[in-house]
């Protein structure tokens, strides 16, 4: 078997909302992945599990199941959304993200993703992690290639 390549492209969009009373930030972060099948046979993308960390704390998890089939020597671009919550011991971030005196409220998040693929009954896991800047002060769409959005998200418990 030849390799299956997973490339984390980046954040496609981040939609933010706040709960002022609870000093809580809700960020829905959509990420883009490229998955390349270098084999001469189709492979199944069984699931994608993702988590987002802020300051070494996991603030969101998501899982997509039964995603897609990638044909021989083909590539597919997949979007997945991770709902995140910044609250409790990190509620000081509410002050940062809602500060009126600054234009861009960039925070650094660690994006982690694991893709499980299957072919001929064999399963393979490929993981990626990357630090990304996300604006927690406004809804933002980032410049990435147009991609197919697979809205089959199941937030992990």
């Amino acid at each position: 078997p030849r390799s299956i390549e997973v490339k984390y492209i980046g954040v496609k969009s981040a939609y933010v909302s706040y709960d002022a009373e609870k000093r809580t930030i809700y960020l829905n972060i959509t990420n883009t992945l490229n998955i390349t099948n270098n084999n001469y046979y189709s492979v199944e993308v069984e699931n994608i599990t993702a988590q987002v960390q802020f300051s070494k704390t996991v603030i969101g998890k998501a899982r997509l199941n039964n995603i897609t089939n990638i044909g021989p020597l083909d590539m597919k671009q997949i979007d997945y959304t991770v709902p995140t919550v910044i609250a409790e011991e990190m509620s000081y971030m509410y002050d940062f993200c809602t500060l009126l005196s600054i234009k861009v409220h960039n925070i650094v998040l660690m994006m982690q993703v694991t893709v499980t693929t299957a072919y001929f009954g064999h399963s393979e896991q490929i993981s990626q992690e990357r630090y990304q800047y996300v604006d927690c002060g406004r809804n933002t769409t980032y410049q990435l290639a147009q991609s197919e959005y697979l809205n089959v998200l199941q937030p992990q418990q």
């Epitope: 409790e88 509620s91 000081y92 002050d95 630090y131 800047y133």
Partner: antibody, heavy 117, light 107 residues
């Protein structure tokens, strides 16, 4: 307005301990971590450790483990720094400050500690 | 631990001049950097947080820039109250560490 009020100067003998305080006011005490720094006369700053009143989470610089202990009295919004087995190397000004994302936004006025026999 | 190398260590300048102080981190600190000003016998005061954002009440002649491992603080048209010592500090991973300081003196 946000204020961090530190206790007064201390003159202590070698081998003794000292406990200084940092009283926070003007904001919700449990929201922000409190940081502690050491500054030797005319020198740069060293981070000792921090204390988060939200969950009592305490982190120390390895260099100060066994030397510094951070505690809290939530009823008075006060964080304490205790230094043990004092030597002349511990003579310095100690600051508390409030943590903010990407910087420490409010600082106490400092507590001067002099270790001398 | 992440080391912060600040330069220059000292600077002799005249009122009205522009100065730039730089800070280099031993690894990527992802803009988690603060700049402080300290006058003799006083507490440090936050000037810039998260590398580029001016703290409340800080005059617009101050500006912070940089990313990755390289950061700088620029002061346009220096005023007499700007003299003192400047420190950078990373807040990426504990232990937070400070630069050695830049002493700004009047020429």
């Amino acid at each position: 307005q946000v204020q961090l009020q530190q206790s007064g100067a201390e003159l202590v003998k070698p081998g003794a301990s000292v406990k200084m305080s940092c009283k926070a006011s003007g904001y919700t005490f449990t929201t922000f971590p409190i940081e502690w720094m050491k500054q030797n006369h005319g020198k740069s700053l060293e981070w000792i450790g921090n204390f988060h009143p939200y969950n009592d989470d305490t982190k120390y610089n390895e260099k100060f483990k066994g030397k510094a202990t951070l505690t809290v009295e939530k009823s008075s919004s006060t964080v304490y720094l205790e230094l043990s087995r004092l030597t002349s190397d511990d003579s310095a000004v100690y600051y508390c400050a409030r943590y903010f994302y990407g910087g420490m936004d409010y600082w106490g006025q400092g507590t001067s500690v002099t270790v001398s026999s | 631990d992440i080391q912060m190398t600040q330069s220059p260590a000292s600077l002799s300048v005249s009122v009205g001049e522009t100065v730039t102080i730089t800070c280099r981190a031993s690894e990527n600190i992802y803009s988690s950097l603060g700049w402080y000003h300290q006058k003799q016998g006083k507490s440090p005061q936050l000037l810039v947080f998260a590398a580029t954002n001016l703290a409340d009440g800080v005059p617009s002649r101050f500006s912070g820039s940089g990313s990755g491992t390289q950061y700088s603080l620029k002061i346009n048209s220096l005023q007499s109250e700007d003299f003192g010592t400047y420190y950078c500090q990373h807040l990426w991973s504990v232990p937070w560490t400070f630069g050695g300081g830049t002493k700004l003196e009047i020429k």
